[in-house]
Interface confidence: low
């Protein structure tokens, strides 16, 4: 399926729209808000009861080339005594983002949008108990 | 820009960096992943730092619907089911890339936009703010 033509029922296509070949779209990859500096609550990944580590994945044919992924450090959660409590579960929280993928076919280059699932951090949950019959 | 390895047999005119503007196929790869977090997991209810999910809709953006997490409590839920204020529920935030219609209302012309979303919440030991 194609990208949903969001709001086409009420959008009047302006005359100023650039001409685009069929089956494709024009994408400016100069990022809006590129320079916003954001830092979450200090050391959130190590202060959490479901702590996590970060790893950076690098792919030169992807834009952005760097994607940071989190991995939960424990199966259980850290209790007030600093010990792992396996009656609770550390689970990953994930979020989709878009990337641009560059594909080489011989000497020609094409670009493809791709959805990537990023693990952002972890949270501590009460486990779902599956009773075995 | 990003430097990429080049096929040595190709002409030198190929740019090693991503160009500023590209023509992109309208089909999105991996686009059928579940985008409604309420359906994809119930972590938001089972977490010791539970959160509510708020629908953020913008027809000038793709995806047009993004779910924002808001922590339900300042503290965390303890083993007795009560809120423990010795711990803090804090949102986990992530910068994501979306498409913004540019110029506005154009069906097939977009610009990448970086936005900050709260994805869920986690329970942390607080940083104590000492009052002078």
């Amino acid at each position: 399926r194609k990208i949903p033509k969001v709001g086409h029922t009420f959008f009047q296509k302006p005359e100023s729209c650039p001409p685009v070949p069929g089956g494709s779209m024009k994408l400016d990859i100069g990022i809006i808000n590129e320079n916003q500096r954001v830092s979450m609550s200090r050391n959130i990944e190590s202060r959490s009861t479901s702590p996590w580590n970060y790893t950076v994945t690098w792919d030169p044919n992807r834009y952005p080339s760097e994607v940071v992924q989190a991995q939960c450090r424990n199966l259980g959660c850290i209790n007030a005594q600093g010990k792992e409590d396996i009656s609770m579960n550390s689970v990953p929280i994930q979020q989709e983002t878009l990337v641009v993928r560059r594909k080489h076919q011989g000497c020609s280059v094409s670009f493809q949008l791709e959805k990537v699932l990023v693990t952002v951090g972890c949270t501590c949950v009460t486990p779902v108990i599956h009773h075995v019959q | 820009g990003i430097t990429i390895p080049r096929n040595p047999g190709c002409p030198n005119s190929e740019d090693k960096n991503f160009p500023r503007t590209v023509m992109v196929n309208l089909n999105i790869h991996n686009r059928n992943t579940n985008t409604n977090p309420k359906r994809s997991s119930d972590y938001y209810n089972r977490s010791t730092s539970p959160w509510n999910l708020h629908r953020n809709e913008d027809p000038e953006r793709y995806p047009s619907v993004i779910w924002e997490a808001k922590c339900r409590h300042l503290g965390c839920i303890n083993a007795d089911g009560n809120v423990d204020y010795h711990m803090n529920s804090v949102p986990i935030q992530q910068e994501i890339l979306v498409l913004r219609r540019e110029p506005p209302h154009c069906p097939n012309s977009f610009r990448l936009e970086k936005i900050l979303v709260s994805v869920g919440c986690t329970c942390v030991t607080p940083i104590v703010h000492h009052v002078a």
Partner: nanobody
Framework: EVQLVESGGGLVQPGGSQRLSCAAS????????MGWYRQAPGKQRELVAL???????DYADSVKGRFTISRDNSKNTVYLQMNSLRAEDTAVYYC??????????????????WGQGTLVTVSS
């Protein structure tokens, strides 16, 4: 740093009304949640009401229909209008907020902050 300063506490008759205010100051960028908690003598601190950045509010069952929380985003202030007060509403009322702020050039989001508390006594 961020400070929360409450005002409006005091002695009020049963059935009467009182309005509490809490102002957040500091280099604040955004306030995700502001609200009120209370602690009666010998009891645990409990939620009274919270108001989220989108304007939606949550209330404790014990105050629904009697208390109204509101906020003035331009002043970084939250209010608690308390009507039909009862003796069991006597407590120290604490303002609480989850705030994003700048400090030393870094943006910090969502640290929980508490005010010093203001005493509300409902008695004849």
């Amino acid at each position: 740093e961020v400070q929360l300063v409450e005002s409006g506490g005091g002695l009020v008759q049963p059935g009467g009304s009182q309005r509490l205010s809490c102002a957040a100051s500091g280099t604040i960028v955004n306030i995700h949640v502001m609200g009120w908690y209370r602690q009666a003598p010998g009891k645990q601190r409990e939620l009274v009401a919270l108001i989220f950045s989108g304007g939606s509010a949550d209330y404790a069952d014990s105050v629904k229909g009697r208390f109204t929380i509101s906020r003035d985003n331009s002043k970084n202030t939250v209010y608690l209008q308390m009507n039909s007060l009862r003796a069991e509403d006597t407590a120290v009322y604490y303002c609480a907020a989850e705030i994003g702020y700048y400090s030393g050039g870094t943006y910090y989001s969502s640290e929980a902050h508490w005010g010093q508390g203001t005493l509300v006594t409902v008695s004849s």
